[in-house]
Interface confidence: low
């Protein structure tokens, strides 16, 4: 038999597991698809992003509703010959999530 | 030109992506390579884990010092023959992370 | 506050190098999108960028004086270093530090060098 | 190298006039990222350059309103709508958008 207390311990765990925004840092250069010359410092930023865990295999945690955020960041051009510019990056942050299922896939891709 | 406020936004915003033992979601299956007619209930639990943000593009986020803590969980077998099993599971939790060198390539890989 | 301050001598022979040192405060070399340079004005005449040096150590020289020129940083002491060999009479001007911003916001006093023997 | 070309040299201005200073550039001043890194300084006698207009129209902060710039590509103007007496020293505009950052030659803004 299981005591009830440990029952609630396993659950509190689970619900801190499930599908929902989380901080997350994300590297703004990949994420803006910028140009090798060009980076940013820093090079991450937090922002929420849907993670953590669904009940079935076939789900998968995904953003239901988005919002865009904006970071300041030195954008620096590769060689150093200007001065580094602060610019306002908008990176998105996610604001819903929810398990769904994987996009099916075509039986000859 | 920057103004000191700004920089220090920016410097804090930095702080917090830098690499550092972060609560993950961690797949309790995966995590301990069992067969596939093994499964935990929760399949997740929350774990500390190396991530963030390493100055350098040669570096990554690796931990350095590692303990193992117990959670209990339901071990399900598949077919249900007996009874949903508590057991303690033990898994990793990063204490200590670093950004260090990623491995050296061999020249032919 | 941000502030600059030159230091080297005033006089300097013909063909000697010239070591200036730049002590700033109000700001940290380690912060990212910092740089400190040196600009210098001969008397009468206008302003000529010499260098600069970024917080990451990368450095950019005016092509025109690149040869001739060394800028350097100690980022636990605040300062920066420029050094300009084989100096001549027409290098004689107050040379700046300044605080590598777009555009130069922080400027330092100036000190005025004389080359003469 | 960018030539950054001011006219008049020297300007004598008298208290309470608008007074005009040109800049001419060699090439565009308009850099990869839309920005035009023009700026406008004032060095008054015995100091160091202070300044006073950034990005070709935004007046540093502490500046008074009656100094304002325009312009775009190659061309750009300083004007001081009433002049005072305090407005006295040599003018300079400077470009940062191509290296090396050059300064113009200066215009000397005396009272009669």
């Known amino acids: 038999f299981y005591d009830i207390e440990t029952l609630k311990v396993i659950d509190e765990e689970w619900q801190r597991t499930q599908c929902s925004p989380r901080e997350t840092c994300v590297e703004v250069a990949s994420e803006l698809g910028k140009s090798t010359n060009t980076f940013f410092k820093p090079p991450c930023v937090n922002v929420f992003r849907c993670g953590g865990c669904c009940n079935e295999e076939s789900l998968i945690c995904m953003n239901t509703s988005t919002s865009y955020i904006s970071k300041q960041l030195f954008e620096i051009s590769v060689p150093l010959t200007s001065v580094p510019e602060l610019v306002p990056v908008k990176v998105a942050n996610h604001t819903g999530c929810k398990c769904l299922p994987t996009a099916p896939r075509h039986p000859y891709s | 030109f920057y103004d000191i406020e700004t920089l220090k936004v920016i410097d804090e915003e930095w702080q917090r992506t830098q690499c550092s033992p972060r609560e993950t979601c961690v797949e309790v299956a995966s995590e301990l390579g069992k067969s596939t007619n093994t499964f935990f209930k929760p399949p997740c639990v929350n774990v500390f884990r190396c991530g963030g943000c390493c100055n350098e593009e040669s570096l990554i986020c690796m931990n350095t010092s590692t303990s193992y803590i117990s959670k209990q969980l339901f071990e399900i077998s598949v077919p249900l023959t007996s009874v949903p099993e508590l057991v303690p599971v033990k898994v990793a939790n990063h204490t200590g992370c670093k950004c260090l060198p990623t491995a050296p390539r061999h020249p032919y890989s | 506050q941000v502030t600059l301050k030159e230091s080297g001598p005033a006089l300097v022979k013909p063909t000697q190098t010239l070591t200036l040192t730049c002590t700033f405060s109000g700001f940290s070399l380690s912060d990212y999108g910092m740089g400190v340079g040196w600009i210098r004005q001969p008397p009468g005449k206008a302003l000529e960028w010499l260098a600069n040096?970024?917080?990451?150590?990368?450095?950019y020289y005016n092509p025109v004086l690149r040869s001739r020129l060394t800028i350097s940083k100690d980022t636990s002491k605040n300062q920066v270093v420029l050094t300009m060999t084989n100096m001549d009479p027409v290098d004689t001007a107050t040379y700046y530090c300044v605080q590598v911003t777009n555009p130069f916001v922080f400027w330092g006093q100036g000190t005025l060098v004389t080359v003469s023997s | 190298d960018i030539v950054m070309t001011q006219t008049p040299l020297s300007l004598p201005v008298t208290p309470g006039e608008p007074a005009s200073i040109s800049c001419r550039s060699s090439q565009s001043l308009v850099h990869i990222n839309g920005n035009t890194y023009l700026h406008w300084y004032l060095q008054k006698p015995g100091q160091s350059p202070q300044l006073l207009i950034y990005k070709v129209s935004n007046r540093f902060s502490g500046v008074p309103d009656r100094f304002s710039g325009s312009g775009s590509g190659t061309d750009f103007t300083l004007k001081i709508s009433r002049v005072e007496a305090e407005d006295v020293g040599v003018y300079f505009c400077s470009q940062s958008t191509h290296v090396p950052w050059t300064f113009g030659g200066g215009t000397k803004v005396e009272i009669k």
């Open positions: 040096i970024w917080w990451n150590d990368d450095k």
